[in-house]
C-alpha cells in the first residue's frame, strides 16, 4: 500500500471474527501440540522421562516458573502483573528454544514451528499488555554465553536438558493458558 | 491493492489490509486468476509459526511475507512472466491453527473463509 493509502482488501467476515482472547488461547494450543510432537522424539529416544536424576540437571538450568507472586494463581490473581511474568517467562525461554533447534534429527521442522509460534505469541501477548515498560528483555551477551554452555555438555546431560525445557515450558504454557482464560 | 502494468522480468509489490478484523490472526494466501482459466493458489503464510508455501510456478520468484505490527501482507513478485497476468485476490482462513497441518493444504481455495476484492496485474511490453 503506497504511503498514506488506507486500503482495505479483506473486508469484515460474516461470522464473528477471531477475537484477540481466542487467538491467543489457539496460539498456545499450537505451541503446546508442538511440544507433544517433540515429547515424543525425546522420550522414544532415550529413557529421559522416566528419570528421576532430574535434579542433576535442573542445576544448571535457570527456566521461567510460575510462583504465587507472579499473580496467575486463582487465588491472588493480577492481569496487569500476570500478563507481564506470561510475556517476560515466554522471552526467557526463547534461548532454551534456540537451544532445542539442533536436538531433534525426524523432528527438525516442528522444533523450527514451535520456536516460531512462540516468537509469535509474544507479539501478540505485546498488542494486549498495557504495561510494556514492566518487561524486562533478557541480555542477548548473557543468552549467548548459556547457550554454548549447554552445548558444551556432555551427552546425557545435553538429552536431560531437552527433556526438562521441553516440561518446564508445556507447565509454564498450560499455566498461562489457565491464567489466560480468566482476563 | 499494488496491482498494475508491469514489463517483463520487471517486479511488483502486493498489499493486503483488512477491515472488521485482525488479519495477523489468520493464514493468508495469495490467489490468482487469469481469464478463461480457474483460480489458483501461488503463496501462503501461516500465523502460527510464519512458514511459508509456493506453488511451483511461482518458486523462487515470488515472496509473501507478513509484518503483524501493521496488520498487512505482502507478496513481493519479481522476474514477472507475461503468464503471470492475471487478477490477484488474498485471502484469509483458519487452515493454520492446528499443530502439523499440511502446508500444501493452503493454495486450496476451499481452505479460506474471506476473500478480496482483487487487484489486476498485466505483464506486457
Known amino acids: 500500500v503506497p504511503p498514506g493509502e488506507d486500503s482495505k482488501d479483506v473486508a469484515a467476515p460474516h461470522r464473528q471474527p477471531l477475537t484477540s482472547s481466542e487467538r491467543i488461547d489457539k496460539q498456545i494450543r499450537y505451541i503446546l501440540d508442538g511440544i507433544s510432537a517433540l515429547r515424543k522424539e525425546t522420550c522414544n529416544k532415550s529413557n529421559m522421562c522416566e528419570s528421576s536424576k532430574e535434579a542433576l540437571a535442573e542445576n544448571n538450568l535457570n527456566l521461567p516458573k510460575m510462583a504465587e507472586k507472579d499473580g496467575c494463581f486463582q487465588s491472588g490473581f493480577n492481569e496487569e502483573t500476570c500478563l507481564v511474568k506470561i510475556i517476560t517467562g515466554l522471552l526467557e525461554f526463547e534461548v532454551y528454544l534456540e537451544y532445542l533447534q539442533n536436538r531433534f534429527e525426524s523432528s527438525e521442522e516442528q522444533a523450527r514451528a514451535v520456536q516460531m509460534s512462540t516468537k509469535v505469541l509474544i507479539q501478540f501477548l505485546q498488542k494486549k499488555a498495557k504495561n510494556l515498560d514492566a518487561i524486562t528483555t533478557p541480555d542477548p551477551t548473557t543468552n549467548a554465553s548459556l547457550l554454548t554452555k549447554l552445548q558444551a555438555q556432555n551427552q546425557w546431560l545435553q538429552d536431560m536438558t531437552t527433556h526438562l525445557i521441553l516440561r518446564s515450558f508445556k507447565e509454564f504454557l498450560q499455566s498461562s493458558l489457565r491464567a489466560l482464560r480468566q482476563m | 491493492s499494488g496491482g498494475g502494468l508491469v514489463q517483463p522480468g520487471g517486479s511488483l509489490r502486493l498489499s493486503c489490509a483488512a477491515s472488521?478484523?485482525?488479519?495477523?490472526?489468520?493464514?493468508i494466501g495469495w490467489f490468482r486468476q487469469a481469464p478463461g482459466k480457474e483460480r489458483e493458489g501461488v503463496a501462503c503464510?501461516?500465523?502460527?509459526?510464519?512458514?511459508?508455501y509456493y506453488a511451483d510456478s511461482v518458486k523462487g520468484r515470488f515472496t509473501i511475507s507478513r509484518d503483524n505490527a501493521k496488520d498487512t501482507v505482502y507478496l513481493q513478485m519479481n522476474s514477472l512472466k507475461p503468464e503471470d497476468t492475471a487478477v490477484y485476490y488474498c485471502?484469509?482462513?483458519?487452515?493454520?491453527?492446528?499443530?502439523?497441518?499440511?502446508?500444501?493444504?493452503?493454495?486450496?481455495?476451499?481452505?479460506?473463509?474471506?476473500w478480496g476484492q482483487g487487484t489486476q496485474v498485466t505483464v506486457s511490453s
Open positions: 485471502a484469509a482462513g483458519t487452515w493454520d491453527l492446528k499443530f502439523g497441518y499440511s502446508r500444501s493444504n493452503c493454495v486450496r481455495s476451499y481452505e479460506y473463509d474471506y
Open positions: 472488521g478484523f485482525t488479519l495477523a490472526y489468520y493464514g
Open positions: 503464510i501461516s500465523s502460527s509459526d510464519l512458514s511459508t
